[in-house]
């Protein structure tokens, strides 16, 4: 049985003829789940970002923006994937002084050709944030675009509801704190959501109404479709807006297209209950 869609795509891979039939399956992957070239797999209630890059044994040492040295650039990208954070090549050759490993190990070898990396205030940017060094203050810029991510309400570890996993990742980036998916559907009580300002810098907006009320008010403009539109939406609800000539489909999670006819593998479906994220 395939553990990822890529298994279906290889000539020697799994027979995935039944892959689309798992209507009740709750995936945990969208295009924003695993950044930095990681492959997202859902195994049980665990989301795994697989970062096996099959790096070769070439010795072309590089120094990463985290102050660590790598055998070659592939190892650096692999580390970025594993950590789900950006690591840039700041110089060829090993770092003059390593920042040390996450395990608390010391320094790595130095190269006479590279100068020591100056510690930057940008090092504080985490959770997918990129640093804008040109800003007067230290700005952690969150270039996470959730506009293409389907509606799939979730309750996050900060006790707030989000429209999809992408928004959770965006909020985590904006607040620079760890926020994870906790359960399917909206939280019982939540009052805050986050938005990104036009320049991409993070801002936080507290709404007077909670997200449930916002959603209800948004739906007041839609009326159910007339009966002759039965079957118009294959996997979703048909809605008619007074502003629109044609009815529209609010697709169920995991489906896309004008009539919700296409299986959408980029959307995040969530396993109910606590979800563990794991990087391997």
């Amino acid at each position: 049985f395939p553990t990822s869609l890529s298994d279906c795509q290889t000539p020697t891979g799994w027979n995935c003829s039944g892959y689309d039939d798992r209507e009740n399956d709750l995936f945990l992957c969208d295009t924003n789940t695993c950044k930095f070239d990681g492959e997202c797999l859902r195994i049980g209630d665990t989301v795994t970002c697989v970062c096996q890059f099959k790096c070769n044994n070439d010795y072309v040492p590089v120094c990463g923006s985290n102050g660590e040295s790598y055998q070659n650039e592939c190892y650096l990208r692999q580390a970025a994937c594993k950590q789900q954070s950006e690591i840039l090549v700041v110089s060829e050759g090993s770092c003059a002084t390593d920042a040390g490993s996450g395990s608390g190990d010391g320094v790595h070898e130095g190269s006479g050709e590279t100068s020591q990396k100056e510690t930057s205030t940008c090092d504080i940017c985490q959770f997918g944030a990129e640093c804008d060094e040109d800003a007067e203050d230290v700005w952690c810029v969150c270039n996470i675009d959730c506009s293409q991510t389907n509606f799939n309400p979730l309750c996050a570890s900060d006790g707030k509801s989000y429209d999809n996993a992408c928004q959770i990742k965006e909020a985590s980036c904006q607040k620079q704190e760890k926020i994870e998916v906790m359960s399917l559907g909206r939280c019982q009580d939540n009052t805050t959501t986050t938005t990104k300002s036009e320049d991409g810098h993070y801002a936080r907006t507290d709404y007077a109404e909670n997200a449930n009320k916002l959603e209800e008010s948004a739906r007041e403009h839609h009326i159910p479709c007339p009966e002759h539109y039965n079957g118009f939406c294959m996997h979703g609800k048909c809605e008619h807006s007074i502003n629109m000539q044609e009815p529209s489909c609010r697709c169920d999670a995991g489906y896309t297209g004008q009539h919700c006819e296409k299986k959408d593998y980029s959307v995040l479906y969530v396993v109910p209950g606590p979800v563990r994220f794991q990087y391997v």
């Epitope: 099959k54 010795y59 072309v60 660590e68 190892y75 692999q78 580390a79 390593d98 790595h108």
Partner: antibody
Framework: QIQLVQSGPELKKPGETVKISCKAS????????MSWVKQAPGKGLKWMGW????????TYADDFKGRFAFSLETSASTAYLQINNLKNEDTATYFC?????WGQGTLVTVSA | DIVLTQSPASLAVSLGQRATISCRAS??????????MHWYQQKPGQPPKLLIY???NLESGVPARFSGSGSGTDFTLNIHPVEEEDAATYYC????????FGGGTKLEIK
């Protein structure tokens, strides 16, 4: 600082198995592959192969396919070389490491 | 496998003079703008020590009297001026495909 510390010398009989350890410290273990090199007494260096410390996938040079096995204990930043069915010609010093850093070497003596 | 042939097998150089060691590969080890040739020094009872990587890059802590050059199939290690502590065996090694070492060159200081 970076250190690769190998296990001590081994005296074995032909047909036995030996397992040499190589413990790395001072750097992130998965940032570099781990190579193994053989040096018979009075001879030159012979590259045996390497193991990808991230995926655990080993690659063996042609002369070292079959009786030789590389493995890892990533959580302990340790690599292993196991030689099965030892022969007299396996008598050598074995080095672990790669490029800029190497272990001190482990002498394996195979004698009846 | 790529075969590396070192020459000479041994040489004796006077203190302060230049030592030149050659390494020829059976096929090119240069690609994508890099020459994947490295040079090591080994003294008796010690592990190898990296001197030069990617044909011409001096490894950290290695004296500037060591230099490397070459591309494609022909590479050279130069030591100038030679000092007494340079007495050792020198190996070239490539890191394309399956790695191999050259046969080694033993440097003696006169």
């Amino acid at each position: 600082q970076i250190q690769l510390v190998q296990s001590g010398p081994e005296l074995k009989k032909p047909g036995e198995t030996v397992k040499i350890s190589c413990k790395a410290s001072g750097y992130t273990f998965t940032n570099y592959g781990m190579s193994w090199v053989k040096q018979a007494p009075g001879k030159g260096l012979k590259w045996m192969g390497w193991i990808n410390t991230y995926t655990g996938e080993p690659t063996y040079a042609d002369d070292f396919k079959g009786r030789f096995a590389f493995s890892l204990e990533t959580s302990a930043s340790t690599a292993y070389l196991q030689i099965n069915n030892l022969k007299n010609e396996d008598t050598a010093t074995y080095f672990c490491g790669g490029d800029a850093y190497w272990g001190q070497g482990t002498l394996v003596t195979v004698s009846a | 496998d790529i075969v590396l042939t070192q020459s000479p097998a041994s040489l004796a150089v006077s203190l302060g003079q230049r030592a030149t060691i050659s390494c020829r590969a059976s096929k090119s080890v240069s690609t994508s703008g890099y020459s994947y040739m490295h040079w090591y020094q080994q003294k008796p009872g010690q592990p190898p020590k990296l001197l030069i990587y990617l044909a011409s890059n001096l490894e950290s802590g290695v004296p500037a009297r060591f230099s490397g050059s070459g591309s494609g199939t022909d590479f050279t290690l130069n030591i100038h001026p030679v000092e007494e502590e340079d007495a050792a065996t020198y190996y070239c090694q490539h890191s394309r495909e399956l790695r191999t070492f050259g046969g080694g060159t033993k440097l003696e200081i006169k």
